[in-house]
């Protein structure tokens, strides 16, 4: 009997408002035993996969997706999904990444703390389970 897979969570480090040219890392979390984490951008047509999974806690695994130098084009909605054989999970909530010009003023902090929900949430759909992990190479456009 197949287990019910918990929804993944998504967060961003150091936050969700990132100065142009700075780095950001998206962190996806799911249960132990995840084979592939996928970070989707705006829609399913643009994504990145990783199988570099590590422990986040005794009951959780995580994967990290790093953008070294954020551009304006990186702004948008991101969400996570994972493959734990033999099926895909539901998507996480959306997290919105905002990219701002570096002003450096005392009243404009460089980043805002990230959260697993993110400032923008949209309902996720559950129709991703027909996909298989892109273990032989990404089948869609790269995120970055």
């Amino acid at each position: 009997q197949e287990e019910d897979l918990p929804r993944p969570s998504i967060s961003a480090e150091p936050g969700t408002v990132i100065p142009l040219g700075s780095h950001v890392t998206f962190v996806c979390r799911g249960p132990v035993g995840v084979q592939t984490f996928r970070l989707e951008r705006d829609s399913r047509s643009t994504y990145n996969d990783t199988e570099d999974v590590s422990q986040a806690s005794p009951s959780e695994s995580e994967a990290r997706f790093r953008i070294d130098s954020v551009r304006e084009g990186n702004a948008g909605l991101y969400r996570c999904i994972y493959y734990k054989p033999p099926k895909w999970s539901e998507q996480s909530d959306y997290l919105e990444l905002l990219v701002k010009e570096s002003s450096g003023g005392p009243d404009s902090p460089d980043t805002e703390p990230g959260s697993s929900a993110g400032p923008t949430q949209r309902p996720s759909d559950n129709s991703h389970n027909e996909h298989a992990p892109a273990s032989q190479g990404l089948k869609a456009e790269h995120l970055y």
């Epitope: 132990v32 996969d49 199988e51 570099d52 999974v53 590590s54 422990q55 990290r64 790093r66 190479g137």
Partner: antibody, heavy 117, light 107 residues
Framework: EVQLVESGGGLVKPGGSLRLSCAAS????????MNWVRQAPGKGLEWVAR??????????YYADSVKDRFTISRDDSKNTLYLQMNSLKTEDTAVYYC????????WGQGTLVTVSS | DIQMTQSPSSLSASVGDRVTITCLAS??????LAWYQQKPGKAPKLLIY???SLADGVPSRFSGSGSGTDFTLTISSLQPEDFATYYC?????????FGGGTKVEIK
């Protein structure tokens, strides 16, 4: 089909150096963490080293027994994993396996390293 | 470092027997545990990951259970090809330590 093929093993004197290679195929190498595991003759398995992906800044981890002597590295353009072994000791004699992470689901056939005078 | 204590170190069994091997972690590792089978002169083969998940192509007579510190590998009905050495390994934190192994021999 996933394949991991190790090479570079052989006979070396104590204090010497050796570089092992592992050619990977049949999977997307650059999105996987990779490991080296060794097994001394007639003994159990010992994890040696791990290297993560670009998303994790190619972070490396080592067993205490090899720290500061062995260096794990990867060349994603060549789908190849390496283990540079310096200051070799007789107790490093073992079969060395290249293993895909994080669940150690695919193993190479191993390459024998013999450290003896 | 997390120590993995595997028992028994060896056992004799007959074809058709139910075989149980246990692994004890020195601290809690959740379900970050794997089991491997190794035959002489061959590389280890993954049987179970995440304590209970069966790896691809592994017969259903193999099963894993446990969480926290106590884990079990069970072979429900031993087959001739199952005579081998079995290892557990914790994947919770580096160094990723293995148990000492259990050699399953023909009675």
């Amino acid at each position: 089909e996933v394949q991991l093929v190790e090479s570079g093993g052989g006979l070396v004197k104590p204090g010497g150096s050796l570089r092992l290679s592992c050619a990977a195929s049949g999977f997307t190498f650059n999105i996987n963490a990779m490991n080296w595991v060794r097994q001394a003759p007639g003994k159990g398995l010992e994890w040696v080293a791990r290297i993560r992906t670009k998303n994790n800044n190619f972070a490396t981890y080592y067993a205490d027994s090899v720290k500061d002597r062995f260096t794990i590295s990867r060349d994603d353009s060549k789908n190849t994993l390496y283990l540079q072994m310096n200051s070799l000791k007789t107790e490093d004699t073992a079969v060395y396996y290249c293993v895909r992470g994080p669940y150690f689901d695919y193993w190479g056939q191993g390459t024998l390293v013999t450290v003896s005078s | 470092d997390i120590q993995m204590t595997q028992s028994p170190s060896s056992l004799s069994a007959s074809v058709g027997d139910r075989v149980t091997i246990t692994c004890l972690a020195s601290q809690t590792i959740g379900t970050w545990l794997a089991w491997y089978q190794q035959k002489p002169g061959k590389a280890p083969k993954l049987l179970i990951y995440a304590a209970t998940s069966l790896a691809d192509g592994v017969p259903s007579r193999f099963s894993g259970s446990g969480s926290g510190t106590d884990f079990t590998l069970t072979i429900s009905s031993l087959q001739p090809e199952d005579f081998a050495t079995y290892y557990c390994q914790q994947l919770y934190s580096t160094p990723y330590t293995f148990g000492g192994g259990t050699k399953v021999e023909i009675k």
